[in-house]
């Protein structure tokens, strides 16, 4: 009878048990972005390192062509940090002249693409006005939350301006997901 | 045959099952830092509360001497928030005089130390330029991501300037990790 | 004997096994806030969408009257992002006149209410001074950490100024929790 203390009761377990070490997981890190054309009103997607340094994918979570592929339906925690850096924005010059203005901004979006849906779904957005006056500035935007995903869904990270992304260190800009 | 719906198939489970409540976990909260000398080019490590208030360590995850000790290999979610506060930086005065300048900055790094490695590994970095003009400023930097850690690894949180860390409330500055 | 590789040993498991898909989880998304009275020195609580779009509650995690109800004791990861937006603060005007001043600020607090406790407990706080000079500004505050909660605990998100919360998109302002 000793084993019964570990035996899940019918009330407790509604799905097959599975070992945690077997769950789809990925942590991707920044790489220098290759120049690519993107449509004017569409935020470009970042591409990522998936196996060197701190980066990894495991248990059928695969990375291909800017996308993380979801191999199994379930609830996933998804996160990303993008560190932006830039020189003084137009904003500050206009401001110094005493005229109010629409601020420059930096934005990160984690997007889900489902092949059967015509439109991508924005899961998470971090957006910040940037009106810096020093000669250069830098700052991170961090996002993270839980979503119910379906097998075959694809995840990507889009940014408002790819040229402002700090690609110099794997700990500054990253993207990850894991099945809960 | 009823029990079979809970029985893991060979395809599903590649590691022993284990109860979630038994996993190494810690949430550490800020304490006032003691006066210490630190080397000029090295970011000082914060020390933490590990048992009072909201803080805890459990299931062999131990805190000692500024380090979280990893008791078991696996994938961990690691997070920290540091709230910084300060008075107007030199930056703003130079700026007001109309000369651009290198901004002051605040930085948080979550670092892994592996005894067999000569150099610590920076897992996560949040860094932000600070060019504030009001008479005082405050802001948080949040970090969180998943990493594959080995038994015996040690985690710490380093900051660019320990004197700017807001130590006044346990909900403002904290550090945690849990095995997935 | 083949099954033994999956059988938890007495050392490994101290609690009943349970399927991950059965754990209490919620992701709530922003809705437009209805004007409500709140006490002067008390931050108002946000109310949330719990079933439309990206929002969901599952496995006995219920949302009612601004609160997430914790159905089962255990360690939970709790997170929220609030995106704030506003027009130029008084702060910048005073500053331009050359007089230093106490900055305006934006604050998010994740609060736990336990019926047997007279006082709510602040679990997480993100607070930021806002001294923007552009004609409008926007920025997120993100929080997330792990806490030991008891069955019956209630969670809410409080903000310093409800009128500054960006309620326009479900990916900008959100609140979630899941049992680890």
């Amino acid at each position: 009878l000793k084993g019964q203390e570990f035996a899940p009761s019918h009330q407790q377990v509604y799905a097959p048990l599975r070992a945690d070490g077997d769950k789809p997981r990925a942590h991707l890190t920044v790489v220098r972005q290759t120049p690519t054309q993107h449509f004017k009103n569409q935020f470009p997607a970042l591409h990522w390192e998936h196996e060197l340094g701190l980066a990894f994918t495991k248990n059928r979570m695969n990375y291909t062509n800017k996308f993380l592929l979801i191999p199994e339906s379930g609830d996933y925690f998804i996160y990303s940090q993008v560190t932006f850096r830039g020189m003084t924005s137009e904003c500050s010059e206009i401001r110094q002249a005493g005229r109010p203005n629409k601020p420059d901004s930096i934005t990160v979006v984690i997007t889900k693409v489902t092949d059967s849906y015509p439109e991508p779904t924005q899961l998470l957005m971090g957006t910040k006005s940037v009106c810096e006056v020093g000669s250069n500035w830098f700052q991170p935007i961090y996002l993270g939350a839980m979503f119910s995903l379906q097998e075959g869904d694809k995840l990507m990270v889009n940014v408002s301006d790819i040229s402002l992304v700090d690609y110099t260190k794997e700990d500054k800009t990253f993207f990850g997901a894991f099945l809960l | 045959l009823k029990g079979q719906e809970f029985a893991p198939s060979h395809q599903q489970v590649y590691a022993p099952l284990r109860a979630d409540g038994d996993k190494p976990r810690a949430h550490l909260t800020v304490v006032r830092q003691t006066p210490t000398q630190h080397f000029k080019n090295q970011f000082p490590a914060l020390h933490w509360e590990h048992e009072l208030g909201l803080a805890f360590t459990k299931n062999r995850m131990n805190y000692t001497n500024k380090f979280l000790l990893i008791p078991e290999s696996g994938d961990y979610f690691i997070y920290s928030q540091v709230t910084f506060r300060g008075m107007t930086s030199e930056c703003s005065e130079i700026r007001q005089a109309g000369r651009p300048n290198k901004p002051d900055s605040i930085t948080v790094v979550i670092t892994k130390v592996t005894d067999s490695y000569p150099e610590p590994t920076q897992l996560l970095m949040g860094t932000k330029s600070v060019c504030e003009v009001g008479s005082n400023w405050f802001q948080p930097i949040y970090l969180g991501a998943m990493f594959s850690l080995q038994e015996g690894d040690k985690l710490m949180v380093n900051v660019s300037d320990i004197s700017l860390v807001d130590y006044t409330k346990e909900d403002k500055t904290f550090f945690g990790a849990f095995l997935l | 004997l083949k099954g033994q590789e999956f059988a938890p040993s007495h050392q490994q498991v101290y609690a009943p096994l349970r399927a991950d898909g059965d754990k209490p989880r919620a992701h709530l998304t922003v809705v437009r806030q209805t004007p409500t009275q709140h006490f002067k020195n008390q931050f108002p609580a946000l109310h949330w969408e719990h079933e439309l779009g990206l929002a969901f509650t599952k496995n006995r995690m219920n949302y009612t009257n601004k609160f997430l109800l914790i159905p089962e004791s255990g360690d939970y990861f709790i997170y929220s992002q609030v995106t704030f937006r506003g027009m130029t603060s008084e702060c910048s005007e005073i500053r331009q006149a050359g007089r230093p001043n106490k900055p305006d600020s934006i604050t998010v607090v994740i609060t736990k209410v336990t019926d047997s406790y007279p006082e709510p407990t602040q679990l997480l706080m993100g607070t930021k001074s806002v001294c923007e000079v552009g004609s409008n500004w926007f920025q997120p505050i993100y929080l997330g950490a792990m806490f030991s909660l008891q069955e019956g605990d209630k969670l809410m998100v409080n903000v310093s100024d409800i009128s500054l919360v960006d309620y326009t998109k479900e990916d900008k302002t959100f609140f979630g929790a899941f049992l680890l």
Partner: antibody, heavy 119, light 111 residues
Amino acid sequence: QVQLVQSGAEVKKPGASVKVSCKASGYTFTSYDINWVRQAPGQGLEWMGWLNPNSGYTGYAQKFQGRVTMTADRSTSTAYMELSSLRSEDTAVYYCAREVPETAAFEYWGQGTLVTVSS
Amino acid sequence: QSVLTQPPSVSGAPGQRVTISCTSSSSDIGAGLGVLWYQQLPGTAPKLLIEGYYNRPSGVPDRFSGSKSGTSASLTITGLLPEDEGDYYCQSWDGTLSALFGGGTKLTVLG
């Protein structure tokens, strides 16, 4: 109103120890750090360290490390500062002060305790 | 270890304005929590006058004001009164989280 009331004057011999008390009233004792500052006759102020009465954690100035011990008795809302291995240069008025958490200012001060070290 | 330097003494007639400076040996003075000023009247404990460079706690007259420029902070007293006579100390917290006091400035009100 907030009050910090310190123990009376002490005369000690070199090599001895002294323990000065600071009884707090008019506020929640565990919510504010207590600092100790001393002032030698005709001299300026010198910071010795801080005590968190809630946790018992302390931070001492480099100069006093190994010689000073700060403690609290929460049941009586009293902070203590003990200085050992006294020498003549330790002759001073010793003040306790309550610190404002947000600004780290010493907002309320005790009346001071004169400690004289003389053989 | 940084040091805060104050002039040993200043003086002024009643009604006049005096300024006491506090200069840091390090690059920025009180970057974390600013500079605080205390008044110590003869035979009494110090009293907080200014926190965070500029801010007066309630009960402190607006004749007292603080300012900052680069590595220096200043306390200005306008409309000097005889009862202002005493010692004035600046204080800040250094990078090692130790509190530093200036050497103190003796204010004499003439006449």
